[in-house]
């Protein structure tokens, strides 16, 4: 029996203060570099150790960044997205989407007290 994998999607506003070495993360994605099938969105690919994002602790690798300082990141070329972050100023507000994987038990084998779904 295969377990079913579900995803819990949440959104969060994260305010970062640019540190001595910047914001401290990498991105992938864009209309010219789709990282997720049928999605040209911008994703966090790496959080740099001891950078502003790592020290804040909320931004995670794999998060989708929806907007920067209120500016939507839809339908942007990869480099245009990069430039948007680089020019975002000292205080940077990110709207992000976290996608948490939730592993459910094998289908048809519900333990006592499990919701019947």
């Amino acid at each position: 029996m295969n377990g079913r994998v579900d995803y819990l999607v949440t959104e969060e506003e994260i305010n970062l203060t640019r540190g001595p070495s910047g914001l401290g993360f990498n991105i992938v994605g864009g209309t010219d570099q789709q990282y997720v099938s049928n999605d040209s969105g911008i994703y966090v690919s790496r959080i740099k150790e001891n950078g502003a994002a790592a020290l804040d602790g909320r931004l995670q690798e794999g998060d989708k960044i929806l907007s920067v300082n209120g500016q939507d990141l839809k339908n942007l070329l990869h480099q245009d997205a990069v430039d948007l972050f680089r020019n975002a100023g000292y205080a940077v507000s990110l709207r992000v989407q976290h996608r948490l994987q939730v592993q459910n038990g094998p289908i048809g084998h519900r333990g006592e007290g499990d919701p019947s779904g």
Partner: nanobody, 125 residues
């Protein structure tokens, strides 16, 4: 596990050419920035050239017009073609890989990289 292996260095005469290669394994090259850096004896490691995750090439001023970076994603390899070599190009050449694009600086910044090869010696003499 990310692995980078450089090859192709050697002894070259001034004005000559050499091509160094960086073969990667353990990851899909398409989404990575790859940088070439060099370190001469007694000097700090410096950026030479890099190619970002969407294929844009960058060069330091001292090698512009002489060096050319290219990538072959199918072969998981990045090349640095070095022409019109000068004695001051003598160094150990390293490649490095970084997943995605830094939102802080270009791929010429060696502080952005976590994964490095072991280096290949190029001597111009």
């Amino acid at each position: 596990d990310v692995q980078l292996v450089e090859s192709g260095g050697g002894l070259v005469q001034p004005g000559g050419s050499v091509r160094v290669s960086c073969v990667s394994s353990g990851f899909i090259l398409d989404y990575y920035a790859i940088g070439w850096f060099r370190q001469a004896p007694g000097k700090e490691r410096e950026g030479v050239s890099c190619i970002d995750s969407v294929g844009r090439a960058y060069y330091v001023d001292s090698v512009k017009g002489r060096f050319t970076i290219s990538r072959d994603n199918a072969k998981n390899t990045v090349y640095l073609q070095m022409n019109s070599l000068k004695p001051e190009d003598t160094a150990v050449y390293y490649c490095a890989a970084d997943f995605g694009s830094s939102v802080d600086s270009t791929c010429l910044n060696n502080q952005q990289y976590d994964d490095w090869g072991q280096g290949t010696q190029v001597t111009v003499s």
